[in-house]
Interface confidence: low
């Protein structure tokens, strides 16, 4: 398994609608045709998978229908958007990139983006 550098922003503030976007950029050592991008969340020393997508270079990222993530790719950059975030989802979101095909297999893991989520104040007439 060969290492690959992955860069991502240190801090991102989610919008009032609970949407956070950031760029994950990887230094591709070869001409990969198939790339897998995974977003991991690290909290309290636990790592959990948020979403993942495999894409062919030049094509769009396809996340599962029920995924909270969407994304677009451009060259060695992936623009990731995570939706539906609440204050409790604040944490470190790590971008993991795998160059799946052709061999050799490369794996790169970013240092993480701290996403801060602030729940909007409820409207005065809200029941919640």
């Amino acid at each position: 398994c060969k290492a690959m550098h992955v860069a991502q922003p240190a801090v991102v503030l989610a919008s009032s609608r609970g949407i956070a976007s950031f760029v994950c950029e990887y230094a591709s050592p070869g001409k990969a045709t198939e790339v897998r991008v995974t977003v991991l969340r690290q909290a309290d020393s636990q790592v959990t998978e948020v979403c993942a997508a495999t894409y062919m270079m030049g094509n769009e990222l396809t996340f599962l229908d029920d995924s909270i993530c969407t994304g677009t790719s451009s060259g060695n950059q992936v623009n990731l958007t995570i939706q539906g975030l609440r204050a409790m989802d604040t944490g470190l979101y790590i971008c993991k990139v795998e160059l799946m095909y052709p061999p050799p297999y490369y794996l790169g893991i970013g240092n993480g983006t701290q996403i801060y989520v602030i729940d909007p104040e409820p409207c005065p007439d809200s029941d919640f």
Epitope: S45, Q46, V47, T48, M100, P103, Y105
Partner: antibody, heavy 121, light 107 residues
Framework: EVQLVESGAEVKKPGASVKVSCKAS????????ISWVRQAPGQGLEWMGW????????NYAQKLQGRVTMTTDTSTSTAYMELRSLRSDDTAVYYC??????????????WGQGTLVTVSS | EIVMTQSPSSLSASVGDRVTITCRAS??????LAWYQQKPGKAPKLLIY???ALQSGVPSRFSGTGSGTEFTLTISSLQPEDFATYYC?????????FGGGTKLEIK
């Protein structure tokens, strides 16, 4: 050091059930799944299914569906595999294995020592 | 299910030999293949994953190649501790399936 330690050998009668345990140590238990693989005497390896230690999701081999249940106890970092309605062709060594993981694919990087289950009348 | 066929089923070789084991999938599995080594009475040990990635701690004399339906495991120079049974495993599609194994014996 990652270790998976399985429970001891079992002898069961046809129709009975067996529950094998697998205690994990040396890594964050909830960051990986536990898969179960069995090997009949002198035969090859057969994947039985896996359980996510994070959320308890399972995926079982279709041929065992309805007879197998996999569970975990995160407080003790232990996985369990129960096989019911045992038949003679269930006689095998049962292995637990680490995987899949969040940072790995559906392959198995650490294995338990194996538990021999003998089904005989 | 995807059927994994290994060849040969058994193989005799000498220390220092170069050995190649083949694994064929009944349908394309991309690079989603792992290789394991198993010694009698012991659990399998992961050697290669993603068709060509060497597992940490595994000697560099082991290498894997292939994609799609045909894969090979090569041991460049056999050592005494390499005599064992080798299995391939696909992790492209449920159910995960293993090859029937290749028993590598001393000539």
């Amino acid at each position: 050091e990652v270790q998976l330690v399985e429970s001891g050998a079992e002898v069961k009668k046809p129709g009975a059930s067996v529950k094998v345990s697998c205690k994990a140590s040396g890594y964050t238990f909830t960051s990986y799944g536990i898969s179960w693989v069995r090997q009949a005497p002198g035969q090859g390896l057969e994947w039985m299914g896996w359980i996510s230690a994070y959320n308890g999701n399972t995926n079982y081999a279709q041929k065992l569906q309805g007879r197998v249940t996999m569970t975990t106890d995160t407080s003790t970092s232990t996985a369990y595999m129960e096989l019911r309605s045992l038949r003679s062709d269930d006689t095998a060594v049962y292995y637990c294995a680490r995987g899949p993981g969040i940072l790995t694919g559906y392959y198995f990087d650490y294995w338990g020592q194996g538990t021999l289950v003998t089904v005989s009348s | 299910e995807i059927v994994m066929t290994q060849s040969p089923s058994s193989l005799s070789a000498s220390v220092g030999d170069r050995v190649t084991i083949t694994c064929r999938a009944s349908q394309g599995i991309n690079y989603h293949l792992a290789w394991y080594q198993q010694k009698p009475g012991k659990a399998p040990k992961l050697l290669i994953y993603a068709a060509s990635a060497l597992q940490s701690g595994v000697p560099s004399r082991f290498s894997g190649t292939g994609s799609g339906t045909e894969f090979t495991l090569t041991i460049s120079s056999l050592q005494p501790e390499d005599f064992a049974t080798y299995y391939c495993q696909q992790f492209n599609t449920y159910p995960l399936t293993f090859g029937g194994g290749t028993k590598l014996e001393i000539k």
